[in-house]
Interface confidence: low
């Protein structure tokens, strides 16, 4: 069921995933429903008692999708809208005033206006969100200084109220980057640069996907499933460097490679994996097994189950089980499945609960 | 691979899964063999730079079995046994000296030494560890009190050095406890106290394997697979209460309740499951699946592959399949399935790795 | 009888400085682990700083960089040099002999503490 309304002094107890901070409780739910598993959150507002918890947004899971309601002054509960139907962005264009987004300043300009800061922000490859200080700002110095920053996971390390800055986010997901936009997958490519993260994708195209969606991916290279080294299969190195470009591409047979599509506008989903991947098992956390009739019927009950994340149908019952196979459905800590098997007979793929959370539809 | 020697002065990089306190490295190694998932650990040396890490035991874990290496002064990492054939023992009969085990000090009284001090603790239901103060401590009326600890997961929750005090633990897991051993279990029973834990179990009686070495567990009730509340169905809650003693016994079709053996001496094994679930499947987070000849293959193969915790056999393929059927091995966060379904035609069980962990082997 | 005599509190601005004593008789001072606990109104009792007999030392978050506890083992004399205060330092300081680790609840009580000052109260204010 779909619950847009926000809970005012109301704390949701138990079942805590993560905490990050976001400038308010919207915000808040955004990041919730975009998280692989958050269902339910609370955000602590400037009214809460506690001003070392201030602008933190807890972000929780529940196998029951509820969680008690404790009363709290100044916590402010809600649903992720993984529940909900409508489309939704991960644009957020607001600014935020008298707060200071706390990251790494790698960055520090003069620039006219707030405006252009977060211009600047957006056109950086590196930049998540900035914090600019006006010209009432205390100190001189540092008044028109537009200060770009960056993060591990992309959200503030912490956010404080300062007075005469404002913050706001970069407008990348807004489709509004002049940065380049690359679609070229490199076949027998690798990228020898940092990696950031690796997860376990079936081919190039979830891998590039999976780097997009990640907030520090400017390029991946995936390992298909003939890679000689077996750890190695089917796995996506997510990559950054300083240049933002890779440095050096080497030559290696059975190894794609690709650049992220977050400066792109997108006339396809980026967000959500629709394809089936035949001869292929998913290996990942259970979350229950049903009969149904083809994996069409497997993958419509993965993307109503709100905590399914992918699944693995097996039709190898069908013969004696009225025309039913078995479909697996799934999830993992990061969206992704822990492992994937070839050669047994499954067929697997994606919830396409994600599809509606993708980027706006016009093309670059 | 059986690594019994520990690494001075290095540091396992990553794979944090929790972090415990510990008098030494030894004992640290023995918790992490005990806890579900821990493979790997570091221990944190008085000859450590921070003295605020001194005595934490950092538990680890990693797909591959191995993490990275790094120089630390102080550090002291190492294996767990869960990789080694010998038996094990939770029995810790040593005395520290000078260390003051942190926890709720619940109950203080006079005693004339500190093995009088340790058999106090060993005869007191909710005993994990104490602390004494020898005849030597600074403050007069402070000497020879024992002081009697408990925590919410058995062990101290911080170590610091204190001077003419000594420390221990509850000999309860050498079967030296006075305390009464029930075997009974009650069927139609449900006991009314706090729940503490609860976890999935196919049986009454792995329930009461779970709550005897559950740290806090006194009593459980077990709901079972006829249990008209889907949701509870398989659920076994282990509780605890002030006295020690259940306070209320609610009469219930399909329920069972019964004791904590962790008083007991046992001619039976309380640790491992060793039984067969038949038409029973187990849901977790899926290891690895592989096609085995039979379901005692499957659990063999479950007790050789070091992450796994339990499995699900599934013989429908055998007819086809030279006949082999197939084996998943599955693990959670606490050992247990996540879930139970029953009717699906799968023979499930545990792993017999934790068969070699059980109590001292003499009838009481 | 032993005693723990704090003293050293009282008002200050924010930003201000404060230097908290402890004068101890009658146990061995030397012997003993201290500490400095606080307690404001109607909040728990919370640890501040100890430092052990050898010299090491530990504080909360909310101090480190402006608190720092020290000890003259000639003098018997615990101290606490609290820098750079703010509103929220507000609260009765208590001086204790640190031999049972730290208080539960409410400051005052002599079980499992050790041995405690009757308090001095700091005030920070503009």
């Known amino acids: 069921e779909c619950v847009i309304k926000l809970f005012s002094d109301i704390y949701f107890q138990g079942g805590d995933i993560t905490t990050v901070y976001t400038p308010n409780a919207k915000h808040c739910q955004v990041v919730c429903t975009y998280h692989p598993r958050c269902l339910l959150f609370t955000f602590m507002a400037e009214s809460s008692v506690d001003s070392t918890k201030w602008f933190s947004c807890i972000l929780k899971d529940s196998v029951t999708e509820s969680l008690p309601k404790v009363n709290m002054t100044g916590a402010i509960s809600g649903y992720s809208f993984k529940q909900c139907p409508h489309q939704l962005s991960a644009c957020n264009k607001d600014i935020y005033v008298d707060l200071d987004m706390q990251g790494m300043n790698y960055n520090g300009s003069v620039t006219k206006n707030a405006q252009e800061c977060q211009e600047r922000c957006t056109n950086d490859a590196h930049c998540h969100f900035f914090t600019y200080a006006t010209r009432q700002f205390p100190s001189a110095e540092h008044r028109n200084i537009c200060l770009l920053k960056y993060t591990q996971t992309g959200a503030p390390t912490g956010i404080r109220k300062l007075k005469k800055v404002v913050s706001g986010f970069s407008l990348k997901s807004c489709a509004l980057s002049n940065l380049a936009c690359i679609r070229d997958i490199f076949p027998s490519t690798v990228f020898a640069d940092n990696n950031i993260d690796s997860v376990v994708a079936p081919d190039a195209l979830v891998c590039r996907r999976i780097c997009t969606h990640h907030p520090n991916c400017l390029f991946f290279t995936f390992f298909s499933q003939e890679w000689p080294k077996e750890s190695h299969r089917n796995l996506c190195l997510l990559k950054t460097s300083e240049s933002g470009l890779p440095s050096t591409r080497i030559h290696k047979n059975q190894a794609l490679s690709g650049f992220s599509l977050q400066n792109c506008r997108h006339s396809i989903p980026v967000f959500c994996h629709s394809s089936f991947y035949y001869d292929t098992d998913f290996l990942g956390e259970e979350l229950d097994i049903v009969d149904v009739k083809g994996h069409e019927a497997c993958q419509k009950m993965c993307t109503s189950a709100i905590r399914c994340q992918f699944f693995t149908y097996s039709s190898s019952q069908e013969s004696h089980n009225k025309g039913k196979g078995t479909c697996y459905l799934k999830l993992s800590s990061n969206g992704s499945p822990t492992k994937i098997l070839h050669g047994r007979g499954g067929i697997s793929g994606y919830t396409l609960r994600l599809c509606k959370m993708d980027n706006v539809c016009t093309t670059k | 691979e059986c690594v019994i020697k520990l690494f001075s002065d290095i540091y396992f990089q990553g794979g944090d899964i929790t972090t415990v306190y510990t008098p030494n490295a030894k004992h640290c190694q023995v918790v992490c063999t005990y806890h579900p998932r821990c493979l790997l650990f570091t221990f944190m040396a008085e000859s450590s730079v921070d003295s605020t890490k001194w005595f934490s035991c950092i538990l680890k874990d990693s797909v591959t079995e191995s993490l990275p290496k790094v120089n630390m002064t102080g550090a002291i990492s190492g294996y767990s046994f869960k990789q080694c054939p010998h038996q094990l023992s939770a029995c810790n009969k040593d005395i520290y000296v000078d260390l003051d085990m942190q926890g709720m000090n619940y109950n203080g009284s006079v005693t004339k030494n500190a093995q009088e001090c340790q058999e106090r603790c060993t005869n007191d239901a909710h005993c994990h560890f104490f602390t004494y103060a020898t005849r030597q401590f600074p403050s007069a009326e402070h000497r020879n009190i024992c002081l009697l600890k408990y925590t919410q997961t058995g062990a101290p929750t911080g170590i610091r050095k204190l001077k003419k005090v000594v420390s221990g633990f509850s000999l309860k897991s050498c079967a030296l406890s006075n305390l009464a051993c029930i075997r009974d279990i009650f069927p139609s029973t449900v006991f009314a106290d706090n729940n503490i834990d609860s976890v999935v179990a196919p049986d009454a009686l792995v329930c009461r394997r779970i709550c005897t070495h559950h740290p806090n567990c006194l009593f459980f009730t077990f709901f079972s697979q006829e249990w008209p509340k889907e949701s509870h169905r398989n659920l076994c809650l282990l509780k605890t209460s002030e006295s020690g003693l259940p306070s209320t016994r609610i009469h219930k079709n399909q329920a069972l309740s019964g004791f904590s053996l962790q008083n007991c001496r046992h001619s039976i094994p309380v640790f491992c499951h060793s039984s067969f679930y038949y038409d029973t499947d187990f849901l977790g987070e899926e290891l690895d699946i592989v096609d085995v000849k039979g379901h005692e293959a499957c659990q063999k193969m479950c007790t050789s592959a070091i992450r796994c915790q339990f499995f699900t056999y599934s013989s429908s393929q055998e007819s086809h399949n030279k006949g082999k059927g197939t084996c998943y091995l599955k693990l959670s966060s606490n050992g247990s399935p996540t879930k139970i379904l029953h009717g699906r035609g799968g023979i499930s069980g545990y792993t017999l790795r934790l068969c070699k962990m059980d109590n001292v082997c003499t009838t009481k | 009888q032993v005693q723990l005599v704090e003293s050293g509190g009282g008002l200050v601005q924010p930003g201000g400085s404060l230097r908290l004593s402890c004068a101890a008789s009658e146990f061995t001072f030397d012997d003993s682990d201290m500490a400095w606990y606080r307690q404001a109104p109607g909040n728990e009792c919370e640890l501040v700083s100890t430092?052990?007999?050898?010299?090491?030392?530990y504080y909360a978050d909310s101090v480190k960089g402006r608190f720092t506890i020290s000890r003259d083992n000639s003098k018997n004399t615990l101290y606490l040099q609290m820098n750079s205060l703010r509103a929220e330092d507000t609260a009765v300081y208590y001086c204790a002999a640190d031999q049972w680790g730290s208080a539960e609840g409410d400051c005052t009580s002599s079980y499992p503490g050790g041995y405690w000052g009757q308090g001095t109260l700091v005030t920070v204010s503009s």
């Open positions: 430092i052990t007999s050898d010299g090491g030392t």
